[in-house]
């Protein structure tokens, strides 16, 4: 369970992958597109409004929480719409949603080392959102053995 | 195997440059974070510099922003560390380091090389 | 002065249980994983635990890591001459935007 409805921070940031790929959302045919791709140097980054909420279940990693509590996030790049886990697809998703958002649109956030992050589902424990063919999507992983692919991970700028 | 040999140390008078070189091999190379730690003569560990796996990040210590630069080339599997405006106090032994990607940690060390700053 | 605070000297006989302590802050300890390293006399350092508690592969099960709140320790049981090294404790820091070591701990087997 979610303590609260309400966020208990929210911060404005761009999404790279480990390898430094930028993360961009396109309005195409009235639905959002998400790619992996260089950007040119001059271009600027899209931003992702990150809003955290404190968790009171663990998730299936032995992570670094706060006290205890997981801290979970949803992730905007624009108004209304939320990154959303699809597992049936194994997919991730940009939807139109209104609040209270569905449990689709929320996951545990994994703190590493130089600002890097991981995303894991909270529909779904041990599945993370990764990067497959340029595009963003669900990823099962292996704790024994793939828990640091550098596929889920991802990098948070200001 | 995985290895990594860092070159370049020496004697240097304060005030001058120095550049060191880690060149990696038995990875690949352009898939990993690299960092430099370095450790004076009976001192501990501290950490210096870090570049992201296609170097758009660079990090460095307070203690040597501004006079030292950490870059990489992937094609030639190696990590650099330039090293200007040396101060006595510059004076260690210079690791580089792999962060590991499962264990998010300092998992692969070169055996050093000595840096000292002195007239 | 190190941002990670551990004990300059630990010693016990062979056979003992020995803890090392590492104490930081909630930017550090507090958010993120503990690494420890042991340094033999004259080597580079060895990665023993990584993500606070997790051993690395090839590292004896007589070394485990916790971590509580904005403290963490390593735990030697059965304690041998070879273990004789100095051990260090790192994390990422997310004010400093930097990795920052314990000063170290000369552990010695008498």
């Known amino acids: 369970s979610i303590t609260g409805i309400s966020p208990i921070t929210e911060s404005l940031a761009s999404l790279s992958t480990y390898n430094d790929q930028s993360i961009t959302f396109a309005l195409e045919d009235e639905s959002y597109e998400i790619y992996v791709e260089d950007l040119k140097k001059d271009k600027k980054k899209d931003k992702v409004l990150l809003s955290y909420y404190e968790s009171q279940h663990p998730s299936s990693e032995s992570g670094d929480g706060v006290d205890g509590k997981m801290l979970m996030v949803t992730l905007s790049p624009t108004k209304d719409f939320w990154l959303q886990a699809n597992n049936k697809e194994h997919s991730v998703e940009l939807h139109k949603c209104e609040k209270p958002l569905p449990d689709q649109a929320f996951f545990v956030l994994h703190n590493r080392s130089f600002n890097c992050v991981s995303f894991e589902c909270k529909t779904d424990p041990g599945v993370f959102i990764g990067v497959k063919d340029n595009h963003l999507a669900l990823i099962k992983v292996d704790y024994s053995e793939n828990l640091g692919s550098e596929n889920i991970l991802f990098k948070l700028s200001e | 195997e995985v290895q990594l040999l860092e070159s370049g140390g020496g004697l240097v008078q304060p005030g001058g440059s120095l550049r060191l070189s880690c060149a990696a091999s038995?990875?690949?190379?352009?898939?990993?974070?690299m960092h430099w730690v370095r450790q004076a003569p009976g001192k501990g560990l501290e950490w210096v510099s870090s570049?992201?796996?296609?170097?758009?990040?660079?990090y460095y210590a307070g203690s040597v922003k501004g006079r030292f630069t950490i870059s990489r080339d992937n094609s030639k599997n190696t990590l650099y560390l330039q090293m200007n405006s040396l101060r006595a106090e510059d004076t260690a032994v210079y690791y580089c380091?792999?962060?590991?990607?499962?264990?998010?940690?300092?998992?692969?060390w070169g055996q050093g090389t000595l840096v000292t700053v002195s007239s | 002065q190190s941002v990670l605070t551990q004990p300059p000297s630990a010693s016990g006989t062979p056979g003992q249980r020995v803890t090392i302590s590492c104490s930081g802050s909630?930017?550090?300890?507090?958010?993120?994983a503990v690494w420890w390293y042991q340094q033999l006399p004259g080597t580079a350092p060895k990665l023993l635990i990584?993500?606070?508690?997790m051993r690395r592969m090839g590292v004896p099960d007589r070394f485990s890591g916790s971590k509580s709140g904005t403290s963490a320790s390593l735990a030697i049981s059965g304690l041998r001459s070879e273990d004789e090294a100095d051990y260090y404790c790192?994390?990422?820091?997310?004010?400093?935007?930097?990795?920052?070591f314990g000063g170290g701990t000369k552990l010695t087997v008498l």
């Open positions: 380091a792999r962060l590991g990607l499962r264990h998010d940690a300092f998992d692969i």
């Open positions: 038995g990875f690949t190379f352009s898939n990993y974070y």
């Open positions: 570049i992201s796996s296609r170097s758009s990040h660079q």
């Open positions: 909630s930017s550090n300890i507090g958010h993120n």
């Open positions: 990584y993500a606070s508690n």
């Open positions: 790192a994390a990422w820091d997310d004010s400093q935007k930097a990795v920052v």
